[in-house]
Interface confidence: low
């Protein structure tokens, strides 16, 4: 079976596909299992290195899991006639490390795409939008599943992985109809701030099992349809007032916060107050403190303001400032000592002069003291200019 998976553009692919015999409705590619009744094709765990070219036109659900596809080029699923019925595409665990721009073009009904468990060292910004236009044609995608797509450290590009994924999600505003986005288990340290603003239709967002420390710069404000927000198993320490207000303002949301290392000090007071009155957080009675040591395993809902104190330790921002100040002062001190050392002879001479001047000065004081002590010389002392 010929395949144009190595093609870097969909145009040559379409040409070759057009010249081949159009696939028969009932044919099934080698190494695949097909069910026309279920509109399903499964090419699972077959070590395929390319997407089969001869997929049947009836396919609605295509499973290409457990293969060795490596690269998904532009137009990887483009056919003539197109696979107009394809609605669900599962490519999980197929050792993909590169998804190029336009890889999912010419799939007009594609609603669900699963790229999970592929070590994506390169995800083109135009993987989902299909073009580099500032505003692309809307993608039909409703569900995008990108769990555990982080590559191993040695395969990572220099650029931030979070930034690479974010660029693909916002390109051309193509994913404005996305309802579900799963980004679990990707070692995310932060969420790029403009991503959610470009996904206004989200109902379900899964960011669980990442390394998110803070949501301070993330805005949920325009996710007015958001129904489930999964933040379990991250590194969240506290949610600040801005985030709390935004979550409370979403009319429909349920938030999942289990298994985060909550820091129960004075900065937690607002979050505890909010937790006690909100219906937004699912399983809020399970949330417990991780730090400081004396608060470990205390239930957040059972805390009151007296429990939430801060040791008289400088906050991290001030600590950083004072460390910097200390370094500057040390440098100034070192320069000062160096100057003293280089001018040691002059300083020695200067010191002698100072000593002599001081001696004369002190003798003057002694003289004045003696005059003041003798009542007979009082008038003289008042006129004296010592």
């Amino acid at each position: 079976t010929s395949s144009a998976s190595s093609s870097s553009s969909s145009a040559p692919f379409l040409a070759s596909a057009a010249s081949a015999q159009p696939p028969l409705p009932d044919q099934c590619p080698a190494l695949c299992e097909c069910s026309e009744a279920a509109r399903t094709v499964k090419c699972v765990n077959r070590n395929l290195t390319e997407v089969p070219t001869d997929l049947p036109l009836y396919v609605r659900n295509l499973f290409l899991t457990g293969n060795q596809l490596a690269v998904l080029p532009a137009g990887a699923f483009a056919r003539r006639p197109p696979l107009a019925e394809l609605a669900a595409l599962n490519l999980s665990g197929s050792r993909l490390d590169e998804v190029r721009g336009g890889a999912f073009e010419h799939l007009p009904s594609l609603r669900q795409l699963d790229l999970s468990h592929n070590p994506l060292a390169y995800l083109s910004p135009f993987a989902f939008s299909g073009s580099n236009a500032s505003i692309s044609a809307p993608s039909p995608l409703v569900e995008l599943i990108l769990n555990h797509i982080v590559p191993p450290d040695d395969k990572r590009q220099n650029r931030s992985f979070e930034g690479m994924v974010a660029a693909a999600l916002v390109a051309g505003r193509a994913l404005q109809g996305l309802h579900l986005l799963e980004l679990a288990s990707n070692h995310f340290l932060y969420l790029p701030r403009d991503v959610l603003a470009q996904l206004p239709s989200l109902r379900y967002l899964d960011l669980s099992n990442n390394s998110l420390v803070s949501l301070t710069y993330v805005s949920f404000r325009n996710l007015t349809h958001l129904e489930s927000l999964h933040l379990e198993d991250n590194a969240l320490k506290v949610l600040h007032n801005g985030t709390l207000a935004e979550l409370q303002g979403l009319p429909h949301v349920r938030v999942f916060l289990d298994n985060n290392p909550w820091v129960c000090d004075c900065h937690m007071a607002d979050m505890v107050t909010w937790l006690k009155q909100t219906g937004v957080v699912q399983g809020k009675d399970r949330l417990t403190c991780a730090f400081p040591e004396k608060m470990r395993n205390r239930v957040l809902l059972e805390l009151n303001s007296a429990d939430l104190d801060c040791d008289p330790i400088l906050p991290p921002s001030l600590q950083t400032s004072y460390v910097f100040l200390g370094i500057v002062l040390a440098l100034i001190g070192a320069i000062f000592l160096l100057v003293l050392y280089l001018n040691r002879k002059g300083i020695k001479k200067w010191m002698h002069n100072i000593r002599d001047a001081c001696r004369d000065h002190m003798e003057g004081y002694h003289y004045r003291y003696e005059i003041n002590a003798d009542p007979r010389l009082t008038n003289l002392s008042s006129n004296s200019d010592v």
Epitope: N61, A87, A88, L180, R203, E227, S228, H252
Partner: antibody, heavy 118, light 110 residues
Framework: QSVEESGGRLVTPGTPLTLTCTAS????????MGWVRQAPGKGLEWIGI?????STYYANWAKGRFAISKTSTTVDLKITSPATEDTATYFC???????????????WGQGTLVTVSS | AYDMTQTPASVSAAVGGTVTIKCQAS??????LAWYQQKPGQPPKLLIY???TLASGVSSRFKGSGSGTQFTLTIGDLESADAATYYC????????????FGGGTEVLVK
């Protein structure tokens, strides 16, 4: 917690009819509410839903033929121009949550019978 | 448009036996499927949601499985009270659908 339908009756074709679902023991702003109908001897037919914050969704065949709205305690289903094939028992049902996604009905009314006949 | 096809339309089994009902979605609905039981003159009752999660107060004799497009409801250790019509319902989307429910399966207990 309960829901109860009312307003079902015999109507002539083309005469608009409004069915009302009254909710007790819970807030309609926290749940998605749906209407489902069942023609005599037939299966269940999904008409549409209104979610916690008031957005409505209809089955393709129901668009334009039905309108769902709500107040703080009731959910209405208006049959804009009833036809004989709209004869059925109409059920009001509450979703498990306020979601429109991953939605299922865990609380049902007993239904109200609408008969459309000339 | 997310059509739900239930098979068989009717099934009969003896008390103590097992019944299996299948539901097929025309497109993948992940695990967002519910099963209901309806007896004559009564409203439907939720049995299972999210394909396999038992609703509150429902006997563990009812078991749901499947994901994507293929789903199964299995009723084990059949009792006469299980005689009813069973419906599947997709909860994946409320947009662009004709009927969220399957056509129903009548279970007769001998």
């Amino acid at each position: 917690q309960s829901v109860e339908e009312s307003g079902g009756r015999l109507v002539t074709p083309g005469t608009p009819l409004t069915l009302t679902c009254t909710a007790s023991g819970f807030s309609l702003s926290d749940y998605t509410m749906g209407w489902v109908r069942q023609a005599p001897g037939k299966g269940l037919e999904w008409i549409g839903i209104i979610n916690g914050y008031g957005s409505t969704y209809y089955a393709n065949w129901a668009k334009g033929r039905f309108a769902i709205s709500k107040t703080s305690t009731t959910v209405d289903l208006k049959i804009t121009s009833p036809a004989t094939e709209d004869t059925a028992t109409y059920f009001c049902a509450r979703g498990d949550t306020g979601r429109t996604y991953d939605m299922h009905f865990n609380l049902w009314g007993q239904g109200t019978l609408v008969t459309v006949s000339s | 448009a997310y059509d739900m096809t239930q098979t068989p339309a009717s099934v009969s089994a003896a008390v103590g036996g097992t019944v299996t009902i299948k539901c097929q979605a025309s497109e993948s609905i992940r695990s967002w499927l519910a099963w209901y039981q309806q007896k004559p003159g009564q409203p439907p009752k939720l049995l299972i949601y999210s394909a396999s999660t038992l609703a509150s107060g429902v006997s563990s004799r009812f078991k749901g499985s499947g994901s994507g497009t293929q789903f199964t409801l299995t009723i084990g250790d059949l009792e006469s009270a299980d005689a009813a019509t069973y419906y599947c319902q997709q909860g994946y989307t409320s947009s662009n659908l004709d009927n969220a429910f399957g056509g129903g399966t009548e279970v007769l207990v001998k």
